[in-house]
């Protein structure tokens, strides 16, 4: 299986939410044989690989953020303890998952990974990210509303808040 | 905070059988691997196995095949190390570690030593 | 399996010097090498993950490096609470494998 960023780099004005997305796809087993673990972090773009680092994301930890669960079930995680940083990840039953963060300040601009990792019985782990860049301006240059820039050469859209 | 509390020493006799507990604190237990790791006197560490107890997938080192067994209980939050038919070889401290998914072994507990003595 | 292989089981340092502490993978195994920490009677300890990355509470004098097949960990400067066995160890692909350890000698 594959993990794809819709977009590789969201501008975002400060006090706005902004959810970040990564899709998964590839054969799926809808067996009992197959969990996936699902979750983001903070990271730094390493030299010999991306997303190596794993660092909190407004104190939470990748662990704190997962979500686990069988085949293309939807998931959620913790509520209280995410939603009072502000924070919710979030997994649909298309393969597409998310983390939504309120209120932005200029702190949260970095760069955001999500991870993935399929858990086979008697299989090694398979394990796949995709990152994706948050520039949080203030000011005059800031956009009124997030602005993400697709990651294949197609133009920029305007995504609404969440 | 995240702890792995387990079970006393054991002194066993060649032949019998033993079960370690490793219970689990301070974190979402189902969602995370726990590691097993063997490391006898004056020696390194080596790695046993995993149990992911949300699924109750394993991975078992091929060495210990036969000779350890993992289970874990999700209503209690404890993974279980059962090693059989002992040996002398077998006296060792027996680690359980947790690990994330796709990542490495973050927090140990202290150690269960086992002494197989006639 | 892949083998890590830590060419010195002692090495002996003063407090204050820098020492570095080698392993060698038997295959490439990119980044996925993590160094643990074992002082006398305790279990090991988390220091380095992912090559390069100090965990969380670890002091800076604490570093990694290496990719592929070839890694290093250094004290930058030894101080005398380091006395403790050092290993590394790869999560590139089961079964988890140890190197040998290194045991860090205070002179």
């Known amino acids: 299986f594959k993990v794809a960023t819709l977009y590789s780099l969201y501008v975002c004005p400060e006090g706005q939410n902004v959810t970040l997305t990564c899709r998964f796809f590839g054969p799926v087993d809808k067996g009992h044989d197959v969990t996936f673990y699902k979750t983001w972090y903070r990271s730094s773009r390493g030299e010999v690989q991306t997303c190596s680092e794993r660092r909190p994301i407004r104190n939470l930890t990748f662990q704190d953020l997962h979500l686990h669960h069988g085949g293309h079930q939807a998931a959620n995680t913790s509520h209280d303890l995410a939603q009072r940083h502000g924070l919710e990840s979030a997994s649909d039953h298309h393969g597409n998952f998310s983390i939504t963060m309120r209120n932005l300040t200029l702190l949260d601009s970095g760069l955001y990974c999500c991870l993935v990792v399929e858990i086979r019985h008697h299989h090694s782990e398979h394990r796949v990210h995709g990152a994706m860049e948050l520039q949080v301006q203030t000011g005059k240059d800031a956009p009124s509303s997030c602005v993400a820039y697709p990651s294949s050469s197609q133009e920029s859209e305007n995504i609404t808040a969440a | 905070q995240v702890q792995l509390q387990q079970s006393g020493a054991e002194l066993m006799k060649p032949g019998a059988s033993v079960k370690i507990s490793c219970k689990a604190t301070g974190y979402t237990f189902s969602s995370s691997w726990v590691e097993w790791v063997r490391q006898r006197p004056g020696h390194g560490l080596e790695w046993i196995g995993e149990i992911f107890p949300g699924s109750g997938s394993t991975h078992y080192n091929e060495k210990f095949k036969g000779k350890a067994t993992f289970t874990a209980d999700t209503s209690s939050n404890t993974a279980y190390l059962q090693l059989s038919s002992l040996t002398s070889d077998d006296s060792a401290v027996y680690y359980c570690?947790?690990?994330?998914?796709?990542?490495?072994?973050?927090?140990w507990g202290a150690g269960t030593t086992v002494t197989v003595s006639s | 399996d892949i083998v890590m292989t830590q060419s010195h089981k002692f090495m002996s340092t003063s407090v204050g010097d820098r020492v570095s502490i080698t392993c060698k993978a038997s295959?490439?195994?990119?980044?996925?090498v993590a160094w643990y920490q074992q002082k006398p009677g305790q279990s090991p300890k988390l220091l380095i993950y992912?090559?390069?990355y100090r965990y969380t509470g670890v002091p800076d004098r604490f570093t990694g490096s290496g990719s592929g097949t070839d890694f290093t960990f250094t004290i930058s400067s030894v101080q005398a609470e380091d006395l403790a066995v050092y290993y590394c160890q790869q999560h590139y692909s089961t079964p988890w494998t140890f190197g040998g350890g290194t045991k860090l000698e205070i002179k």
């Open positions: 295959q490439d195994v990119s980044t996925d």
């Open positions: 992912s090559a390069s």
């Open positions: 570690a947790r690990r994330p998914p796709g990542w490495f072994f973050d927090v």
